[in-house]
Interface confidence: low
């Protein structure tokens, strides 16, 4: 089985590295920069020409348990008159993040890293026009 | 930590919260999703608040490559293709979790790290500050 890039590295292994069983890795989930602040512009989700809402998904077997997802409010974009302009499109912007998934098999517990795609917000784009032959 | 439901038949020794350190399978679930935003969509060019994507590479981190968005304009692109300075292009930021090699250079020992990335830009009506 091919080991994915997360473990495969060109680094020389220092003597101080902790011993790790084959096929697994040691992960400290005490988060570095836990308390850093997002300095995003105030309520841009409402002020955007492609506004969005937030919903919180909660899963007790995931770390972190809360993941916030955005959903575009409109198909079109909001024009200067505050009306929806369907000649333009509101589209989601997405970003991958890592989570730790806990799996129960009988009474034993295992942990798995998982990539999750998070919708962060929306942007207004000119639509791609498909010309029919 | 977070609380989880437990199989009532299991011994009571199991902690309800996530332990501080866990052994994790090396295979990452969903790891083959496309991580290059330039290939996954062309929104960065078609947006009314277009952005450029800058490659941030760090071999001590997984994923080692992260793409950072930088808005191209102060204003937004209007219907005529010109920059309208009565609107603002602003970055959409997101906190994501990555793995940081700890101790440094160790191939299979990591710590979770929260980093702030600009994912793209959106066009907003500006905040008008009235001077008293």
């Amino acid at each position: 089985r091919k080991i994915p890039k997360v473990g495969h590295t060109f680094f020389q292994k220092p003597e101080s590295c902790p011993p790790v069983p084959g096929g697994s890795m040691k992960l400290d989930i005490g988060i570095i920069n836990e308390n850093q602040r997002v300095s995003m512009s105030r309520n841009i989700e409402s002020r955007s020409t492609s506004p969005w809402n937030y919903t919180v998904t909660w899963d007790p077997n995931r770390y972190p348990s809360e993941v916030v997802q955005a959903q575009c409010r409109n198909l079109g974009c909001i024009n200067a008159q505050g009306k929806e302009d369907i000649s333009m499109n509101s589209v989601p912007i997405q970003q991958e993040t890592l989570v730790v998934r806990r799996k129960h098999q009988g009474c034993s517990v295992s942990f798995q890293l998982e990539k999750v795609l998070v919708t962060v917000g929306c942007t207004c784009v000119t639509p791609v026009i498909h010309h029919v032959q | 930590g977070i609380t989880i439901p437990r199989n009532p038949g299991c011994p009571n020794s199991e902690d309800k919260n996530f332990p501080r350190t866990v052994m994790v399978n090396l295979n990452i679930h969903n790891r083959n999703t496309n991580t290059n935003p330039k290939r996954s969509s062309d929104y960065y060019n078609r947006s009314t608040s277009p952005w450029n994507l800058h490659r941030n590479e760090d071999p001590e981190r997984y994923p080692s490559v992260i793409w950072e968005a930088k808005c191209r304009h102060l204003g937004c692109i209007n219907a005529d293709g010109n920059v309208d300075y009565h609107m603002n292009s602003v970055p959409i930021q997101q906190e994501i979790l990555v793995l940081r090699r700890e101790p440094p250079h160790c191939p299979n020992s990591f710590r979770l790290e929260k980093i702030l990335v600009s994912v793209g830009c959106t066009c907003v009506t500006p905040i008008v500050h009235h001077v008293a």
Partner: nanobody, 119 residues
């Protein structure tokens, strides 16, 4: 940015900010500062389209923001400096024509120049 440095209280400094790669003919340029352990705050702003200027109360009458359109440069003349003016000073462009916007509305930022005022 350039022009930072150390000065005695009551002294003067002139900061300059050249916008390379962009012509800000109709936008906002702002000077912001951040002292250790404090939030970044707006000090002075100029609307390059018409030259309108705005100042924080703490610097009114002491600081002057100006522009040289030919050089695509904005200046901050700082007179009667006080120890509490000690901070890292940043030049930024943004604000979408509404210059008194918070720092996060400003898109392009300089690297910063240190100003230290000793008593």
């Amino acid at each position: 940015e350039s022009g930072g440095g150390s000065v005695q209280a009551g002294g003067s400094l002139r900061l300059s900010c050249a916008a390379s790669g962009y012509t800000y003919s109709n936008a906002c340029m702002g000077w912001f500062r951040q002292a250790p352990g404090k939030e970044r705050e707006g000090v002075a702003y100029i609307y390059t389209g018409g030259g309108s200027t705005y100042y924080a109360d703490s610097v009114k009458g002491r600081f002057t923001i100006s522009q040289d359109n030919a050089k695509n440069t904005v200046y901050l003349q700082m007179n009667s400096l006080k120890p509490e003016d000690t901070a890292m000073y940043y030049c930024a462009a943004g604000g979408g024509g509404y210059c008194r916007a918070p720092p996060e509305e400003y898109v392009f930022w300089g690297q910063g120049t240190q100003v230290t005022v000793s008593s």
